[in-house]
Interface confidence: low
Amino acid sequence: YPYDVPDYAGGGGSGGGGSMMTGTIETTGNISAEKGGSIILQCHLSSTTAQVTQVNWEQQDQLLAICNADLGWHISPSFKDRVAPGPGLGLTLQSLTVNDTGEYFCIYHTAPDGTYTGRIFLEVLESSVAEHGARFQIP
């Protein structure tokens, strides 16, 4: 990495420090959007008093963005043109292409609970398909 990005207090997966993990992640679930458009990826951590130290947004194994309690937002350089922070701890994807179809993960790093992960599946549809109201569904 030729650039500096913030650290985060977690490593992925779940659990940490032997504490009881009571929290749950609510996500926007499976969503579809039109090619060329924008979409907001949103997660919400509830049912825990743990401190959120960082939220990571990942697409498969690629780091998209980090929102760090110490240092604020960092967008990975390869996504700077098409990813905007927010609203809140969410992430806005712009200028969508069909290649953006896939799984996205919000990874909440908390103290003392550990790591909570939410999953969103995004399908980017060709304009004509989206206009006819097609929706992605997991069978």
Epitope: D4, P6, D7, G11, G12, N68
Partner: antibody
Framework: EVQLVESGGGLVQPGGSLRLSCAAS????????MHWVRQAPGKGLEWVAF????????YYADTVKGRFTISRDNAKNSLYLQMNSLRAEDTAVYYC????????????WGQGTMVTVSS | DIQMTQSPSSLSASVGDRVTITCRAS??????LAWYQQKPGKAPKLLIY???TLQSGVPSRFSGSGSGTDFTLTISSLQPEDFATYYC?????????FGGGTKVEIK
């Protein structure tokens, strides 16, 4: 070039105190989480403590909790480990290590400083 | 705490051999495992993180695989400079824990 240089080790009696320092250079220190890891003579590696870039997240191994304090001074590019109530089993080489940008793996390590606790 | 068990604890091999070291976690750590190489009197060196991602500057003869609880470090063709001790470390959760090490010696 990333460099981490530990200092402050030495011989101390049981119950005594030591303060280890780690001087960082060659990277933007204030953007990286940092670890202390130790290695007893002839033994394996043991993680000791972690501090996030802005010090908002601090974690300790159970074996040192309540006795050791990790801290950092980003203005001085320095990491510290204050060790109190030292025991014979704390005898080890102590390494400071930089956390990778994206995971808790440790991508750069110092050369280590030896701490010997003995009467 | 997650216990990391490495095997074997030591092995003897010759230059050019294919060497495999395994690491088992006491519970699932997803893909979050790192491998380090340490030579006598030196600091550890990161080889692989996140299970299979090669750290920059590490030769491609090193590779990592596995997820969940079982992981493998493979050296495809052992070189003279590879004789060392290798450690695995889970970076899934606090407290971060290391395996006991595997010493690779010259046969």
């Amino acid at each position: 070039e990333v460099q981490l240089v530990e200092s402050g080790g030495g011989l101390v009696q049981p119950g005594g105190s030591l303060r280890l320092s780690c001087a960082a250079s060659g990277f933007t220190f204030s953007n990286f989480g940092m670890h202390w890891v130790r290695q007893a003579p002839g033994k394996g590696l043991e993680w000791v403590a972690f501090i996030s870039s802005g010090s908002s997240s601090i974690y300790y191994a159970d074996t040192v909790k309540g006795r050791f304090t990790i801290s950092r001074d980003n203005a001085k590019n320095s990491l510290y480990l204050q060790m109190n109530s030292l025991r014979a089993e704390d005898t080890a080489v102590y390494y400071c290590a930089r956390m990778r940008l994206d995971y808790y793996a440790m991508d750069y390590w110092g050369q280590g400083t030896m701490v010997t606790v003995s009467s | 705490d997650i216990q990391m068990t490495q095997s074997p604890s030591s092995l003897s091999a010759s230059v050019g051999d294919r060497v495999t070291i395994t690491c088992r976690a006491s519970k699932s750590i997803s893909k979050y495992l790192a491998w380090y190489q340490q030579k006598p009197g030196k600091a550890p060196k990161l080889l692989i993180y996140s299970g299979s991602t090669l750290q920059s500057g590490v030769p491609s003869r090193f590779s990592g695989s596995g997820s969940g609880t079982d992981f493998t470090l493979t050296i495809s063709s052992l070189q003279p400079e590879d004789f060392a001790t290798y450690y695995c470390q889970q970076h899934n959760e606090y407290p971060w824990t290391f395996g006991g090490g595997t010493k690779v010696e010259i046969k």
